[in-house]
């Protein structure tokens, strides 16, 4: 059941024509490299998980989302340091007992082989060669993706 | 001191046509509602503040960033119902004791008159009438934000 | 239709135990904080407990704290309480309630069940 | 906890009287106040919620007021329908919530 202010804004948006939506991004921003259909920005600092995750979220980004082991590995492909580890958009959802990206969807255990525990305040981390479960409050850099593809008719889900 | 992975990334970005960036929120994607030079979404849903933040950042978007009590009221106005809560990006940071927008700046005591505790775990929400400390989680819903502004020229900060 | 319906309740003697169930039909079960109260005959309103949308954050009244369970199962849309060790001043008519959508744990009470009475007596 | 105590616990009235209960917080509550109706063998019917804001389908008779420690419920006009016990309900973060003892509204 819609609240009144949800139902004035679905009315406000559908009486507008549709093509007035969003351009989507065509090239990638200064200092954003691009990874196929995806613009990469890989951190210089360091922080913990969720002030990583804050951080994309103001640069209208999201943290690094991946598909599939292919992906995985192009993007690893991007790091030059071994020993350096970053953030993705993966942590351990304590209530569902599962790794749970955050678009909510939940990891398909062949994408990652995750090195460490499963358990409460477990984010994941990737490194040139691997995947790994670190504690959340970990302070290290972070990956920020922004979909490179057009999003003119990309329909939010319900939130 | 930048990796390789940033200097390369930076040469790749600085030889490119700096035209070719972002063209920014020209207009409002279906279902967000235009504030000014914001785009707002309203969730319909409710979710602790954390997984508020994760939503809006797969979304390419901020948990809202209110830059003065002009913003606020004019944000307020779009809430239709008296008693419904919406998180925005505002927690209480334990280590500097003190509320820190999730951009990183600090508030200004003057901006928003916070009724609650600042303490641990506390994240603020607004009503059609307060600005309230809850409990981080407190499962609300919550308002995403996108620029509407063009960033062409818009650099993101070292991060 | 929108509805809450109560099940479980009876007699039991002190010590003893007890599950209430609660089945919800006609909203989206897993946006709402959902609460049991109760009402001793002749008496007024206790809340008892709640428990948030996805079952993360959960509340008692100290008059129950560790001897009753508050739980839910989203895919069934049904909220229980489990109550151990019961006592004589447990005797009420315990009430499913719903609160009003995204107030937080501000819980007004939307919707209610008939209710189920649960008699602790030797 | 907070304690909620509503006056006066019982008052006769007729149809057509205009009815005001208070209910008094033993510390500030902000608006987080509710008003709850309900009779004989029945569940409670949220009338008020946020001191003053009329819940969907409820008569426009009834009318809530007030904010910090001192709240107030108004019938206009008694209906016979409107012949019951009536609570008011604290709702802020600090818990347990609590009920006013009830004030039962009487034929006279």
């Known amino acids: 059941q819609k609240s009144s202010i949800e139902k004035c804004s679905v009315d406000i948006q559908q009486s507008r024509n549709k093509t007035t939506e969003r351009p989507g991004l065509l090239n990638c921003p200064i200092y954003w490299q691009q990874l196929r259909e995806k613009c990469l920005l890989f951190s210089h600092t360091v922080n913990p998980w969720n002030n990583s995750l804050a951080d994309c979220s103001t640069k209208e980004s999201s943290l690094l989302l991946i598909r599939d082991k292919d992906e995985l590995i192009h993007t690893q492909n991007l790091i030059r340091d071994k020993a350096i580890l970053f953030w993705i958009g993966l942590n351990f959802s304590l209530s569902e007992k599962n790794w749970k990206w955050i678009n909510g969807s939940f990891l398909n255990s062949n994408d990652l082989e995750i090195r460490g525990d499963a358990k409460e305040n477990s984010c994941i981390s990737i490194s040139q060669t691997s995947v790994y479960s670190e504690y959340c409050s970990t302070e290290i850099r972070w990956i920020c993706q922004k979909e490179l593809t057009p999003v003119r008719n990309k329909v939010y889900p319900d939130s | 001191q930048k990796s390789s992975i940033e200097k390369c990334s930076v040469d790749i970005q600085q030889s490119r046509n700096k035209t070719t960036e972002r063209p920014g929120l020209l207009n409002c994607p279906i279902y967000w509602q235009q504030l000014r030079e914001k785009c707002l979404l309203f969730s319909h849903t409710v979710n602790p503040w954390n997984n508020s933040l994760a939503d809006c950042s797969t979304k390419e978007s901020s948990l809202l960033l209110i830059r003065d009590k002009d913003e606020l009221i004019h944000t307020q106005n779009l809430i239709r119902d008296k008693a419904i809560l919406f998180w925005i990006g505002l927690n209480f940071s334990l280590s500097e004791k003190n509320w820190k927008w999730i951009n990183g700046s600090f508030l200004n005591s003057n901006d928003l008159e916070i009724r609650g505790d600042a303490k641990e775990n506390s994240c603020i929400s607004i009503s059609q009438t307060s600005v309230y400390s809850e409990y981080c989680s407190t499962e609300i819903r919550w308002i995403c934000q996108k620029e509407l502004t063009p960033v062409r020229n818009k650099v993101y900060p070292d991060s | 239709q929108v509805q809450l319906v109560e099940s479980g309740g009876g007699l039991v003697q002190p010590g003893g135990s007890l599950r209430l169930s609660c089945a919800a039909s006609?909203?989206?079960?897993?946006?709402?904080?959902m609460s049991w109260i109760r009402q001793a005959p002749g008496k007024g309103l206790e809340w008892v407990s709640y428990i948030s949308p996805s079952g993360a954050t959960i509340a008692y009244a100290d008059s129950v704290k560790g001897r009753f369970t508050i739980s839910r199962d989203n895919a069934k849309n049904s909220l229980y309480l489990q109550m151990n060790s019961l006592r004589a001043e447990d005797t009420a008519v315990y009430y499913c309630a719903r609160s009003l959508m995204s107030t937080g744990t501000h819980l007004y009470f939307d919707l209610w069940g008939r209710g189920t009475l649960v008699t602790v007596s030797s | 906890d907070i304690q909620l105590t509503q006056s006066p616990s019982s008052v006769s009235a007729s149809v057509g009287d205009r009815v005001t209960i208070t209910c008094r917080a033993s510390q500030g509550i902000s608006s987080w106040l509710a008003w709850y109706q309900q009779k004989p063998g029945k569940a409670p019917k949220l009338l008020i919620y946020?001191?003053?804001v009329l819940q969907s389908g409820v008569p426009s008779r009834f009318s809530g007021s007030g904010s910090g420690t001192d709240f107030t419920l108004t019938i206009s006009s008694l209906q016979p329908e409107d012949f019951a016990t009536y609570y008011c309900q604290q709702v802020t973060s600090f818990l347990p919530y609590t009920f006013g003892g009830g004030t039962k509204v009487e034929i006279k």
């Open positions: 006609g909203f989206t079960f897993s946006q709402y904080y």
């Open positions: 946020a001191a003053s």
